[in-house]
Interface confidence: low
């Protein structure tokens, strides 16, 4: 993992998410990526917090939905989380999300 | 029921360890991003680490870089805190806190980025 | 860093009376997603705190509707509708668009 690396969540990722939680390494939290994002979290590797992805995400996290735009997935969405490896807070992977 | 419990504080004297340990339960563990969260006496919160659902991605706020380190075992459901090099100033109350990341549905991803279970948090005391 | 600046840091309010808490921050919040990850947190006398608003204005699962949160950009505001005794704590902002995670210095709701 990244012990410090950026100040925002990480970026984009270029892996599919994992279930509830977003993994990074970076210091800001992750831009948008480029595949769908898990239900639960994000998985990535930069320091920034990611950013939703541009695939479909996954189906359990939050019970309500935000007041801001979704950032919609182009593929099928994964289960909880999504898995990403930038600098900032993970964002979205490029590939397919998992299920759960 | 969702449910976090913190073990491993107590008092250590300047220069010593300690090992925080976080039991998870009721929930997917390996699924989130976990965090240790502080609070010195009578004082506000402070982050202190966090680490991505897998373990891979860790940081750490700059008054603990390089002494503390932050560690999970997905098997275990648990969350580690190992705290090298003690100082007055790293007495507090430490909070183990899921965060919710969001999740995707229908094509499309939210958002949300917000502590939603804390634990009751475990008292690290440093002091000669 | 981003820095959280809340204001009062005492309310002390009259049950049934309105309260009003301001966080603000050293520079804007807004994460290159377009979300805004902005956080209330009530921390009950003798225990952990207790997640409330998300994202500027959204209420948790089971706060009570007499807590919103409303703001943009770097200004932020949590208002109780009408206090009640149970809502007696220490209140804070938190932002999580980036590393490090920040916290107010919180803000203390306590009865006339």
């Known amino acids: 993992g990244v012990t410090s690396a950026p100040d925002t969540r990480p970026a984009p990722g270029s892996t599919a998410p994992p279930a509830h939680g977003v993994t990074s390494a970076p210091d800001t939290r992750p831009a948008p990526g480029s595949t769908a994002p898990p239900a639960h979290g994000v998985t990535s590797a930069p320091d920034t917090r990611p950013a939703p992805g541009s695939t479909a995400p996954p189906a359990h996290g939050v019970t309500s939905a935000p007041d801001t735009r979704p950032a919609p997935g182009s593929t099928a969405p994964p289960a909880h989380g999504v898995t990403s490896a930038p600098d900032t807070r993970p964002a979205p992977g490029s590939t397919a999300p998992p299920a759960h | 029921q969702v449910q976090l419990v913190e073990s491993g504080g107590g008092l250590v004297k300047p220069g010593g360890s300690l090992r925080l340990s976080c039991a998870a339960s009721g929930f997917t563990f390996s699924d989130y991003y976990m965090s240790w969260i502080r609070q010195a006496p009578g004082k506000g919160l402070e982050w202190v680490s966090y680490?991505?659902?897998?373990?891979?991605?860790?940081y750490y706020a700059d008054s603990v870089k390089g002494r503390f380190t932050i560690s999970r075992d997905n098997a275990k459901n648990s969350l580690y805190l190992q705290m090298n090099s003690l100082r007055a100033e790293d007495t507090a109350v430490y909070y183990c806190?899921?965060?919710?990341?969001?999740?995707?549905?229908?094509?499309?991803?939210?958002?949300?980025?917000?502590?939603?279970?804390w634990g009751k948090g475990t008292t690290v005391t440093v002091s000669s | 860093d981003i820095v959280m600046t809340q204001t009062p840091l005492s309310s002390p309010v009259t049950l049934g009376q309105p309260a009003s808490i301001s966080c603000r921050s050293s520079?804007?919040?807004?994460?290159?997603?377009?979300?805004?990850?902005l956080s209330w947190l009530q921390q009950r006398p003798g225990q952990p705190p207790r997640l409330l608003i998300y994202?500027?204005?959204n209420r948790f699962s089971g706060v009570p509707d007499r807590f919103s949160g409303s703001g943009a950009g770097t200004d932020f505001t949590l208002k109780i509708s009408r206090v009640e005794a149970e809502d007696v704590g220490v209140y804070y902002c938190m932002q999580a668009t980036q590393f490090p995670l920040t916290f107010g210095g919180g803000t203390k709701v306590e009865i006339k």
């Open positions: 680490i991505s659902s897998s373990g891979t991605t860790k």
């Open positions: 806190v899921r965060e919710n990341i969001g999740y995707c549905t229908g094509g499309n991803c939210f958002y949300y980025y917000y502590m939603d279970v």
């Open positions: 520079q804007s919040l807004v994460h290159s997603d377009g979300n805004t990850y």
């Open positions: 994202k500027i204005s």
